[in-house]
């Protein structure tokens, strides 16, 4: 059997809503022919399912085989190195992969100007892989919150952080002209999920927006 292959040092999930990626660190001194076998265990079924026999990358998209994550007790994954006829011991994820491990994101933030007010609309993620009935708002049906970071340019570049409990918000601009920039980070008050800041969206207010149009 020759020298035993070392196991991948660590294996972990990095997940967003219906985007579930398994990662692992490479074994030391891997050869060009080293690849990695991935297996998955669903809690409650208790048998390992082989997912990939020979992945040469250091990550694997498990979304398609974990579509029921949001209605299940979760998963564990394991990875081992394979080189020809040799293989390493398995390295197993050290935490259960469940809905709690999913990092919350928003789809986008849209800003528009109306009567000198900036209206913000938070678009929820709509991943292609998600089954039709599994929308963000049906899975996280209560206690959705969003931290809003507002930056004014020109200005002293400090962010104003506020929490809102709706996907719509509006900004009172006090007649100020310039660029208003907004970032949003989602959370669910009843859950411990991490949230990720959206990319910054900006909109410019000029004097013309402060005339009465009522």
């Amino acid at each position: 059997h020759g020298t035993e292959l070392p196991s991948p040092p660590s294996v972990w999930f990095e997940a967003e809503f219906f985007h579930h990626i398994l990662h692992w660190t490479p074994i030391p001194n891997q050869s060009e022919s080293t690849c990695y076998e991935v297996a998955l265990l669903r809690y409650g079924i208790e048998s390992w399912n082989s997912i990939s026999n020979c992945s040469q990358t250091l990550s694997y998209d498990l979304t398609a085989v974990t579509l029921d994550l949001y209605h299940s007790n979760g998963y564990r994954a394991r990875v081992r190195a394979v080189d020809g006829s040799r293989h390493s011991n398995w390295t197993v994820t050290n935490t259960r992969f469940s809905v709690d491990e999913v990092t919350l994101t928003v789809g986008s933030v849209n800003l528009e100007i109306h009567n000198g007010f900036i209206l913000g609309k938070i678009q929820l993620p709509r991943p292609k892989m998600a089954p039709a009935n599994d929308t963000y708002e049906s899975i996280f049906s209560h206690f959705r919150e969003y931290e809003i970071a507002i930056r004014k340019v020109p200005g002293n570049f400090t962010f104003t952080h506020k929490k809102v409990k709706h996907e719509n918000f509006s900004l009172l601009t006090s007649g100020e002209v310039g660029e208003f920039c907004v970032q949003v980070k989602p959370s669910v008050a009843s859950r411990s999920n991490k949230g990720m800041w959206s990319k910054e969206e900006c909109i410019s207010l000029t004097r013309q927006y402060f005339t009465v149009t009522n």
Epitope: N115, G116, F117, I148, I150, K152, T160, K162, V164, F169, S170, L171, L172, T173, S174, G175, F180, F210, T211, V212, T213, N214
Partner: nanobody, 125 residues
């Protein structure tokens, strides 16, 4: 310091109308925004309407858009909320609020400095 006094609340049948008034102790030009908020038992204060006093520009959340109208009378130092096509879910305590200058930007209760005592609106079906 700005004192605010609401009036005009009361009971009305669903589909009816009410007009709330908010009298300010200072001229409105010393205030950036005047707004109406409402709060029903066990819920947070939610914004209903806001007016930018310098231009008269207004904004309404979707829940009241097309039914409620905020307006101002600078001479009388008063802001009004005309409420039409009232529904039972409009039942709440209605508060008038003002802020001189906001660096908070977000249209929510925390952004407003001055508050009235509130006036009760009850809509029965």
């Amino acid at each position: 310091q700005v004192q605010l006094q609401e009036s005009g609340g009361g009971s009305v049948q669903a589909g009816g109308s009410l007009r709330l008034s908010c009298a300010a102790s200072r001229y409105l030009y010393s205030i950036d925004y005047m707004a109406w908020f409402r709060q029903s038992p066990g819920k947070e204060r939610e914004p209903v309407a806001v007016i930018y006093t310098a231009s008269g520009a207004t904004f309404y959340p979707d829940s009241v858009k097309g039914r409620f109208t905020i307006s101002q009378d600078n001479a009388k130092m008063t802001v009004y909320l005309q409420m039409n096509s009232l529904k039972s879910e409009d039942t709440a305590m209605y508060y008038c609020a003002a802020v001189r200058k906001t660096d908070s930007y977000l249209f929510d209760a925390q952004s407003f400095t001055y508050w009235g005592q509130g006036t009760q609106v009850t809509v029965s079906s």
